[in-house]
Amino acid sequence: EEELQVIQPDKSVLVAAGETATLRCTATSLIPVGPIQWFRGAGPGRELIYNQKEGHFPRVTTVSDLTKRNNMDFSIRIGNITPADAGTYYCVKFRKGSPDDVEFKSGAGTELSVRAKPSAPVVSGPAARATPQHTVSFTCESHGFSPRDITLKWFKNGNELSDFQTNVDPVGESVSYSIHSTAKVVLTREDVHSQVICEVAHVTLQGDPLRGTANLSETIRVPPTLEVTQQPVRAENQVNVTCQVRKFYPQRLQLTWLENGNVSRTETASTVTENKDGTYNWMSWLLVNVSAHRDDVKLTCQVEHDGQPAVSKSHDLKVSAHPKEQGSNTAAENTGSNERNIY
């Protein structure tokens, strides 16, 4: 009788992560008597995948009933495949021996390849905010994909970026891979509403790439511009001084009025108006009783924005002249109950 052969008809099998892999194996004879076992890899450190008679293999089922007397089909199914299952699987016939069964013949092996989707890209920006004209770095990471080939693109508001560096790790063979990319983005004053997008394309995604986004509103700081103006109000001895705080982002802002260097009032921006570009405007005003002052008054509007060093703008109020004669023609907008008389 012809010597037993172990036949593994499939040289390779490709399975998507999470699915079931079927590894086929048949023997050409019932002799010699002994079990079939499945291994991943070859040599002394090979991993036992299935032993018909002994051991715990909760993910493995047999295709046919191995207890049938003349069964020669030793195919198995492995459930819930992950990239870690990739490798070459061998169906091995043993003959009964003492004390241990002895390996008799091995199949040629079936290479199991696992296709695994990349994880959703995670985009992260700089830890600290930056101002317009500065260049900031964004990183994009995605993990757990196989095979290694992958494409990553960066976009800002739909426009593809070119200044980025991408690495896929590890460099050599692995069960799964990770991608890491760093893009450089130059900020503009109009970027409060802008978005940076990282797009990952992979064979497992069937042409529907994964995207990760970062809002530049989390990254940008647009410092305010200040303008201090005065005009007469109500009685002739009262002057309305306004401080216009324009085009700032984020909203976190504290304003302090100083009279000849002494703190007069401090307030926090609350009722702001939003510009189309996402920046904010705010105005604070002060009623100054001119008759209470003999000398000229230096009024300073000091603004601390988003924890940054304070910026200020001063205005000299001349007490000697008639208030009406020195008004600015800039209209003041009443935006809240910010009245304060200086006596």
Epitope: K53, E54, G55, D65
Partner: antibody, heavy 114, light 108 residues
Amino acid sequence: EVQLQQSGAELVKPGASVKLSCTASGFNFEDTYIHWVKQRPDQGLEWIGRIDPADGDTKHNPKFHDKATVTVDTSSNTAYLELSSLTSEDTAVYYCVRGNYVNWGQGTTLTVSS
Amino acid sequence: QIVLIQSPAIMSASPGERVTLTCRASSSVTSSYLYWYQQKPGSSPKLWIYSASNLASGVPARFSGSGSGTSYSLTISSVEAEDAASYFCHQWYSYPRTFGGGTKLEIK
């Protein structure tokens, strides 16, 4: 539900023999080996031997070669462990275990005493 | 035969502590064939870890197993009162199948 139901406790005299049984249900009896394991009071586990119910093939721990015999009756899905020339050293709990090592019988307590 | 030596034989730990039990083999055992069991007084052993590092069904995630060759370990990241038991390692790489002497884990 997979079950291995073992026979009840035994009190036997030194020099005698005893046959412990283990009846399987909830799985194909010929699928996997049945092992027998000994545990003396407050001691570790010792592997006695195993049998393949499909063909009766057995393997024994050399330490138990003259002490233990394992057999099966496939018609009743039952495995047996026979212990001979009993001494106080044989006082222990004996477990039958399915080949997957997940399913263990509840154990049979054997006491050897005069 | 392959002799499995477990250490320590007895150990005591407080809830929340990290605990590691070791199992050394007298000759190399492929990890696929190294199992761990938990046994509580009056009960049959339960398969706890199979193939050196895989948790059996129902085993809490605070347990983990690792090792290769002649050195294996079972670790509990944050021990709980219900983990008080004896733990046995076991090889079925070669005949005769053997078990370690066990580690009795007591919780303070």
